[in-house]
Interface confidence: low
């Protein structure tokens, strides 16, 4: 079905009623390439149209570029020209008579969506039954609003918690802050998977995923490769890795022929035991023992040093 | 299984109409803009509207402003495009993408819109 | 409008070469580009959003890079299954456009 509008010349009335379903509201964008339309409509099309804004008042005229005015489609302008004004009119001057189109409210929008953050951003591990907590923060432009949509491996969960919120910037600050916390109380192994926060301004999405692994319950093991011997020379730098599974991370305490290492200038005691000069006199038996901090769970492993003098 | 189907396609002649459909199913629909992007016999990728997920914005290339229409249902998580005034030029198979401008992350199949006397 | 600029239009490599796609815009996009392989007969499937984040599911062996002006798609051991056109797309302003495509064949 085509629709037809019929112009009636009208030197009395010069602007026409806009057809738009969004009358008398302009949406823009502070962006130095893009224009917006304001939809004051002309019954005459040979008229000397110039744009008003306000406050303070600006009057802006066609230059033959990118401000024009046309009498079906209105008066185009860059955005950021009007970006300041609460409202902006038409005006049209007819033999020393002024007429004035209805008023548009400016409205300015934005869009761009700067990143998306989550936190904890990596290596996130829990048992089951613990409590997982994702905040995810969008950074945007100002003058924007944010949609946030979350995807997970068991989105039917019972017990999940969603809560979005603006967070306060600095006074001058260029940007907006967004935060979306998702919070699954009790998680279970189902819940072990990819999570996928992804933010929309309407016009932009940004989107950043982090991997949460779910064990069935604390524990702590070695990891393969923890070596039984080490050979080293006088005078060489010895570094012997404590490899091990776990979660909750492990508290590590070596021994060397069963009396507690301390760590000081010469020996660091901590996951990696290093030796910084090895001398003959630190041959011998070193215990490691892995203690599980929730579980109390204990494993130990002897690796043997050998220290040859040349 | 996120889906997009497109159907509505078909020869016009010049001038005429057309209604294409997106039937989106396997997530939820009323979340997300859609769009519709074209892609001519042989051509590379164009796109053509975007509508944000409550319809409050509504963008479109300039060569098709004031000929195409693009809306949604979300009730029935559908996509449409009413295609009027129509040119040889628009000869082209039209896909229905989710996502927003940023990515069309979901793709349908595409549906063939042919536009001759 | 932005203009976006492939290059090469077409390009033939072997099995396991490393093959490099340039693209280039009319104006500064920061990072707001994306890229997609078309095979044919199919849809269009995005790989790479934001100029080098892999999206999920896509093999590793892509990868994209660059800022501003000048971005580049990478594949680092060609497949047989990689055969297909790859679009680069801007989002830093309407209209959104898409470059001319690269073709890529296996010799």
């Known amino acids: 079905a085509s629709v037809i509008y019929v112009y009636v010349q009208d030197y009395r009335s010069p602007f026409i009623a806009s057809v738009s379903d969004q009358h008398g509201v302009v949406y823009i964008t502070e962006n130095k390439n893009k224009t917006v339309v304001i939809p004051c409509l002309g019954s005459i099309s040979n008229l000397n149209v110039s744009l008003c804004a306000r406050y303070p008042e600006k009057r802006f005229v066609p230059d033959g570029n990118r401000i024009s005015w046309d009498s079906k489609k209105g008066f185009t302008i860059p955005s950021y020209m009007i970006s300041y004004a609460g409202m902006v009119f038409c005006e049209a001057k007819i033999n020393d008579e002024s007429y004035q189109s209805i008023m548009y409210i400016v409205v300015v929008v934005g869009y761009r969506i700067y990143d998306v953050v989550l936190s904890p951003s990596h290596g996130i591990e829990l048992s089951v039954g613990e409590k997982l907590v994702l905040n995810c923060t969008a950074r945007t432009e100002l003058n924007v609003g944010i949609d946030f949509n979350w995807e997970y491996p068991s989105s039917k969960h019972q017990h999940k918690k969603l809560v979005n919120r603006d967070l306060k910037t600095q006074s001058g600050s260029e940007m907006k802050k967004f935060l979306s916390t998702l919070t699954i109380d009790g998680v279970t192994r189902s819940d072990q998977g990819l999570y996928t926060c992804a933010a929309s301004s309407g016009l932009m999405t940004k989107k950043n995923s982090t991997f949460v692994r779910v064990h069935e319950k604390p524990f702590v093991a070695f990891g393969s490769g923890m070596e039984s011997l080490v050979e080293a020379t006088v005078g060489e730098r010895v570094r012997i890795p404590a490899k091990y599974l776990g979660y909750p991370p492990p508290e590590i305490k070596w021994y060397k022929n069963g009396i507690p290492l301390e760590s000081n200038h010469t020996i660091k005691a901590g996951h990696v035991l290093t030796i910084m000069e090895v001398s003959e006199r630190d041959t011998g038996n070193y215990t490691v023992i892995l203690t599980n901090p929730i579980s109390k769970e204990k494993q130990s492993h002897v690796v043997s040093l050998v220290v040859y003098v040349p | 299984q996120v889906n997009l189907r497109e159907s509505g396609g078909g020869l016009v002649k010049p001038g005429g109409s057309l209604r294409l459909s997106c039937a989106a199913s396997?997530?939820?629909?009323?979340?997300?803009?859609m769009n519709w992007v074209r892609q001519a016999p042989g051509k590379g990728l164009e796109w053509v509207a975007s509508?944000?997920?409550?319809?409050?914005?509504?963008f479109y290339t300039d060569s098709v402003k004031g000929r195409f229409t693009i809306s949604r249902d979300n009730s029935r998580s559908s996509l449409f495009l009413q295609m009027n005034s129509l040119r040889a030029e628009d000869t082209a198979i039209y896909y229905c993408?989710?996502?927003?401008?940023?990515?069309?992350?979901?793709w349908g199949q595409g549906t063939m819109v042919t536009v001759s006397s | 409008d932005i203009q976006m600029t492939q290059s090469p239009s077409s390009l033939s490599a072997s099995v396991g070469d490393r093959v490099t796609i340039t693209c280039k815009a009319s104006?500064?996009?920061?990072?707001?580009l994306n890229w997609y392989q078309q095979k044919p007969g199919e849809a269009p499937k995005l790989l790479i959003y934001?100029?080098?984040i892999l999206e999920t599911g896509v093999p590793s062996r892509f990868s994209g890079s660059g800022s501003g002006t000048d971005f580049t798609f990478t594949i680092s051991s060609l497949q047989p299954e990689d055969i297909a056109t790859y679009y680069c797309?801007?989002?830093?302003?309407?209209?959104?456009?898409f470059g001319g495509g690269t073709k890529l064949e296996i010799k």
């Open positions: 509508i944000t997920s409550g319809s409050s914005y509504i």
């Open positions: 993408a989710r996502g927003s401008a940023s990515a069309f992350d979901i």
């Open positions: 104006d500064d996009i920061i990072n707001y």
């Open positions: 934001d100029a080098s």
């Open positions: 396997g997530f939820t629909f009323g979340s997300y803009t």
């Open positions: 797309q801007q989002y830093d302003i309407l209209p959104l456009t």
